[in-house]
């Protein structure tokens, strides 16, 4: 059993069919030393009698918040929540697998630049009952400071039958170095709670690994005098980090046609524009990367050839 | 090219070969995050490889203030990729075959360290830890582990020079 | 993009020779080696060994030294597989293929096959 | 050489069934190996590379496992366009070899 914060308490109990599960031994805060009686939740039914109450937790049933009363008043309150460990694996019922980069991907995280600053984000199922709380930092052993708001809901999609939530956090680190080369990843660890069940979820990752730059912007076109073809140009996305002679991009610029089974002309380029041929009712598109590094590619920024 | 003394590198140079060797250190290894390495066993580490790190004055004010700083820093760091590319981690099992991109990374590492340091000149260099695996599955780790920290080294350095060549050459 | 035409099928007698041609297009061809394998009817695949067309150098299976010589012509981009001494057991379906860029011998692009039958 | 030891050499399964085809080397590969997947008349085609990832545009019921020498292809569920043959190979050492394959039929 360890703290979870003040009075709330997680159980850490193997989880199998006829599990002898975990003695607990919850103490009352209070000086008092008699007539002290224990009750769970709501119910008026007393548990036992003194400053110290044992308890067997096996089950949900055993979890809950535990309060000591003395004479009608209340005098401490111990939540229980239970992490449930099945055949050596902690369980992970609370948020969905995004499979994507790989399998167990719960978390998945996000950065526009080399600043510090990041977005993870996770997806549920469960509409109530939840809480997240997010911490991080840069490193393990001697770790770092990263500074992490709340977790908000920030999407609800419809995935079939299903309700699917999307929370996400923002996180920055507390002394950011964007022009040096990271050694030691930053870390994100989730507490899940719904209901009685807790659950913890963690992310691993270098932040040149999660970069995303948004999409080129005021991408333009400009026919070219008796030709089919048009240059192209754009900008580095307000977002991306400075100066970028050093922190430099690179895009891939592509003519689609109407039909997606036309064939795609791709160009690769590291300036800011570009000759194509603009076919009729195609569409040019055109999105970056880290010119040195590959990671992410942005989105589409598009315009119609018309 | 850059001395100790302090004269300047030809950047456009180092520019153009640090761009190849990005290409190169991700033809070499393309993976991303193919098997978290970070949880693979780490008896023999890469810990020692020489980081560029937020004192090594390879931002684009340190750059400014005295490029020599940081352009020792990728110096030693090419010396230490190039001994480690030329070691029996990448000559052994998992047998490489002739076309592959570690050889001509290793030949690209060692010209653009003596771009910046040409003969007669010595900057330190950092001691290369004795890494001999003997299993195919240590060698392989190591490879792996090595091609994704130079890919981030280079990736710094290539910035170095691409700052450099737009904002320092003469 | 890349491709491996493959020369057609042979039918040959025992003792004698023939020579599969493999014209690759879409990639520098002295930049990647060519691999050669084969597959006996209703048979898992053997490696036979490759040649880098950059130096000319081959390298062979044991298994196949003295009975195969892999060779390149740079000016026509095209890989040539010849087997001597033709027995019944080398009917096959002969593939060149090449391999991914990173180094390995991860086969990802194919020539159609040849198909060789030794037959009295 | 280095011996790939492939099981089962033919299956039949049924469609949305889990299948699973096991390779053994001889000795440490690490996890350099790959699996193809051959259908009738056609040529091998790249579906995993180091033991578990997953080739380009590969569907992700396709799944690899293993390291050093035991090594598994997972279909997690079956589709009748997977009838074919699979074939394991090793690419840690010359000679490179690859298993004897695994006959994949619908029931």
């Known amino acids: 059993i360890w703290e979870l914060k003040k009075d709330v308490y997680v159980v850490e109990l193997d989880w199998y069919p006829d599990a002898p599960g975990e003695m607990v031994v919850l103490t009352c805060d209070t000086p008092e030393e008699d007539g002290i009686t224990w009750t769970l939740d709501q119910s008026s039914e007393v548990l036992g009698s003194g400053k110290t109450l044992t308890i067997q937790v096996k089950e949900f049933g055993d979890a809950g918040q535990y309060t000591c009363h003395k004479g009608g008043e209340v005098l401490s309150h111990s939540l229980l929540l239970l992490h449930k460990k099945e055949d050596g694996i902690w369980s992970t019922d609370i948020l969905k697998d995004q499979k994507e980069p790989k399998n167990k991907t719960f978390l998945r995280c996000e950065a526009k630049n080399y600043s510090g600053r990041f977005t993870c984000w996770w997806l549920t199922t469960i509409s109530t009952d939840l809480t997240f709380s997010v911490k991080s930092s840069r490193g393990s052993s001697d770790p770092q400071g990263v500074t992490c708001g709340a977790a908000t809901l920030s999407a609800e999609r419809v995935r079939g039958d299903n309700k699917e939530y999307e929370y996400s956090v923002e996180c920055q680190e507390d002394s950011a170095c964007p022009a040096a080369e990271e050694s030691l990843p930053i870390e994100v660890m989730v507490d899940a709670v719904h209901k009685l069940k807790y659950e913890n979820y963690t992310s691993s990752f270098f932040i040149r690994d999660i970069i995303k730059p948004d999409p080129p912007k005021n991408l333009q076109l400009k026919p070219l005098k008796n030709s089919r073809q048009v240059e192209v140009s754009w900008e580095y996305p307000d977002t991306w980090s400075t100066p970028h002679s050093y922190f430099s991009l690179t895009f891939c610029v592509q003519v689609q046609g109407k039909s997606k089974r036309e064939k795609k002309d791709r160009v690769f380029t590291d300036k800011t524009s570009a000759t194509v041929i603009c076919r009729k009712n195609a569409s040019i598109s055109v999105r970056a990367q880290d010119r040195y590094y590959s990671s992410s590619w942005s989105e589409w920024a598009s315009v119609p050839c018309s | 090219r850059a001395v100790p003394g302090g004269s300047s590198p030809a950047w456009t140079q180092c520019q153009q070969l640090s761009q190849k060797l990005c290409t190169l250190a991700w033809s070499a290894h393309p993976l991303v995050g193919h098997m978290d390495l970070r949880e693979e066993g780490d008896e023999e580490t890469t810990n020692d490889v020489p980081h560029i790190q937020c004192g090594d004055g390879c931002d684009p004010q340190g750059l400014r203030d005295n490029s020599q700083f940081c352009l020792q820093r990728i110096h030693q760091g090419l010396i230490f990729y190039e001994k480690l590319l030329g070691s029996d981690i990448f000559t052994g099992e998992p047998s490489l075959l002739p076309d592959s991109p570690v050889g001509q990374l290793h030949a690209s590492l060692l010209g653009l360290s003596q771009l910046l340091q040409p003969e007669g000149h010595h900057w330190e260099t950092q001691q290369i830890p004795s890494l001999s695996p003997s299993q195919p599955w240590q060698r392989l780790l190591l490879r792996f582990k090595i091609l994704r920290s130079l890919q981030a080294f280079v990736a710094v350095a290539a910035r170095v020079f691409a700052h450099g060549a737009a904002t320092l050459s003469p | 993009q890349v491709q491996l035409v493959q020369s057609g099928a042979e039918v040959k007698k025992p003792g004698s020779s023939v020579k599969v041609s493999c014209k690759a297009s879409?990639?520098?061809?002295?930049?990647?080696?060519i691999h050669w394998m084969r597959q006996a009817p209703g048979q898992g695949l053997e490696w036979i060994g490759y040649?880098?067309?950059?130096?000319?150098?081959?390298k062979y299976n044991e298994n196949f030294k003295g009975k195969v010589t892999i060779t390149a012509d740079k000016s026509t981009s095209t890989a040539y597989m010849e087997l001597s001494s033709l027995r019944s057991e080398d009917t096959a379906v002969y593939y060149c293929?090449?391999?991914?860029?990173?180094?390995?011998?991860?086969?990802?692009?194919w020539g159609q096959g040849t198909l060789v039958t030794v037959s009295s | 050489d280095i011996q790939m030891t492939q099981s089962p050499s033919s299956l039949s399964a049924s469609v949305g069934d889990r299948v699973t085809i096991t390779c053994k080397a001889s000795?440490?590969?690490?996890?350099?190996v790959a699996w193809y997947q051959q259908k009738p008349g056609k040529v091998p085609k790249l579906l995993i590379y180091?033991?578990?990832t997953r080739h380009t545009g590969v569907p992700s019921r396709f799944s690899g496992s293993g390291s050093r020498t035991d090594f598994t292809l997972t279909i997690s569920s079956l589709q009748p366009e997977d009838v074919a043959d699979y074939f394991c190979?090793?690419?840690?050492?010359?000679?490179?070899?690859f298993g004897s394959g695994t006959k994949l039929e619908i029931k």
């Open positions: 293929a090449i391999p991914d860029r990173s180094g390995y011998a991860l086969f990802i692009y």
């Open positions: 879409g990639y520098t061809f002295t930049d990647q080696t």
């Open positions: 040649i880098y067309p950059r130096d000319d150098s081959p």
């Open positions: 000795r440490d590969v690490a996890i350099a």
């Open positions: 180091w033991a578990s």
């Open positions: 190979h090793q690419y840690s050492s010359y000679p490179f070899t």
